[in-house]
């Protein structure tokens, strides 16, 4: 089971949004296949995506076991048609990934405005709580469950007739804002983890929702 003519993987990159986590790498295989291993700093290596011709491996099931742990992955290269043999002593070429801590590094997915309701001069805007694949006691957790008060939402809201965007913030998934009676407003939200110091502290903005459309309700 020689490993001649296999090249080590390179450009190992974590792609993670709302804890859905995929390891990607290069090159596209020619006459070789890959196996991925993942471990925590103190744990044992666990093999995933055995002898795959893909250049990505979904590691979500492993990282959601403890999103605050730091993980390391490695990608082994084998000749195409390789079959594991117990007598093999030669270690195939492999490359390590950067370390990855899901809680600190997963990107925040684009949020969605679930609903808004106007009562007089107040509008209640609700952000949809996204479900993740993180579990506690066999129950899937929402983004809010996982991040708690570390996650805030910024609401941008503006009169349909003007360009200036007012803002409000919440550490729940609800906003209650003051509006002018008889005016139509538009809304967009952004998820933020202010404690992060890196480029993944903000989500992209939600789609804009405006009053007078189907998501809203108005009551006097």
């Amino acid at each position: 089971s020689g490993t001649t003519n296999t090249v080590a993987a390179y450009n190992l990159t974590w792609k993670s949004t709302n804890f859905k986590t995929i390891l990607e790498w290069e090159p596209k295989p020619i006459n070789q296949v890959y196996t991925v291993q993942i471990s925590t700093k103190s744990g044992d290596w666990k093999s995933k995506c055995f002898y795959t011709a893909d250049t990505e491996c979904d590691l979500t099931d492993e990282i959601v076991k403890d999103v605050k742990q730091t993980y390391l992955a490695r990608v082994f290269s084998y000749p195409a048609g390789h079959v594991e043999s117990t007598g093999s002593t030669e270690e195939p070429p492999y490359e390590n990934s950067p370390e990855f801590t899901p809680y600190l590094e997963t990107n925040l997915g684009q949020p969605t405005i679930q609903s808004f309701e106007q009562v007089g001069t107040k509008v209640n805007v609700t952000v949809q709580d996204e479900w993740t694949l993180v579990r506690r006691n066999d129950t899937f957790l929402s983004l809010r469950d996982v991040f708690g008060k570390d996650l805030i939402y910024t609401l941008y809201y503006w009169k349909s007739s003007s360009s200036g965007k007012k803002t409000a913030k919440t550490n729940t998934n609800e906003f209650l804002i003051d509006v002018d009676k008889g005016e139509n407003y538009c809304f967009s939200v952004q998820a933020v983890i202010p404690s992060r110091r890196t480029a993944n502290r903000k989500s992209t903005d939600s789609p804009v929702e405006c009053m007078g459309h189907e998501k809203g309700e108005s009551r006097e």
Partner: antibody, heavy 120, light 107 residues
């Protein structure tokens, strides 16, 4: 180290224009919100406006609405305050400040300020 | 816009004194109130955030509290370097607004 450095202040005649810069280092402005705040001589702090460089959204205080424009160049990691139709009452030290968009913290870092004097 | 009414506008105190400055918001601002210290010719510095939390590096003699829409900054034992102007600010909603400032002078 987080730093904000304002520049571009000076003496300008009423009705004139000036562009202030706020150069950021130690962080990426598109990950934060940048505000401009001014302080007239011997007076208190007055908020001018903000920009979220990640989406270009802005909002302005009523006294400057229609005259001042805030923009950002993320490639230069710099925010700008374009001031047109300047009036004597716009004379002030202008500060830029970083907003971490936290529910809890407001402006955690400020620049040293740049003085704008509007006088004939 | 939310008004922040700060009092007193100035006060004279001695080193070691306990000093209290108050701010009243014209409507509910939750705990979204910050306190800043400003010395002549310098930019403001954040002291207290979220009404009662001490910002990193700020001495523990500074504290903040909230009761409804009333907010208080307390300096438990005034030090020579504390003579400055103090501002409250609400950042609950746009536009963020500042109190008028309180100048703490040496008696």
């Amino acid at each position: 180290e987080v730093q904000l450095v304002e520049s571009g202040g000076g003496l300008v005649q009423p009705g004139g224009s000036l562009r202030l810069s706020c150069a950021a280092s130690g962080f990426t402005i598109s990950d934060y919100v940048i505000h401009w705040v001014r302080q007239a001589p011997g007076k208190g702090l007055e908020w001018v406006g903000y920009i979220d460089p990640s989406n270009g959204y802005t909002y302005y205080a009523d006294p400057v609405k229609g005259r001042f424009t805030i923009s950002a160049d993320t490639s230069k990691n710099t925010a700008y305050l374009q001031m047109n139709s300047l009036r004597a009452e716009d004379t002030a030290v202008y500060y830029c400040a970083r907003d971490p968009q936290s529910f809890y913290i407001a402006f955690d870092y400020w620049g040293q300020g740049t003085l704008v004097t509007v006088s004939s | 816009d939310i008004q922040m009414t700060q009092s007193p506008s100035s006060l004279s105190a001695s080193v070691g004194d306990r000093v209290t400055i108050t701010c009243r918001a014209s409507q509910d601002v939750n705990t979204a109130v910050a306190w800043y210290q400003q010395k002549p010719g310098k930019a403001p510095k954040l002291l207290i955030y979220s009404a009662s939390f001490l910002y990193s590096g700020v001495p523990s003699r500074f504290s903040g509290s909230r009761s409804g829409t009333d907010f208080t900054l307390t300096i438990s034992s005034l030090q020579p370097e504390d003579f400055a102007t103090y501002y409250c600010q609400q950042h609950y909603t746009t536009p963020p607004t500042f109190g008028q400032g309180t100048k703490v002078e040496i008696k």
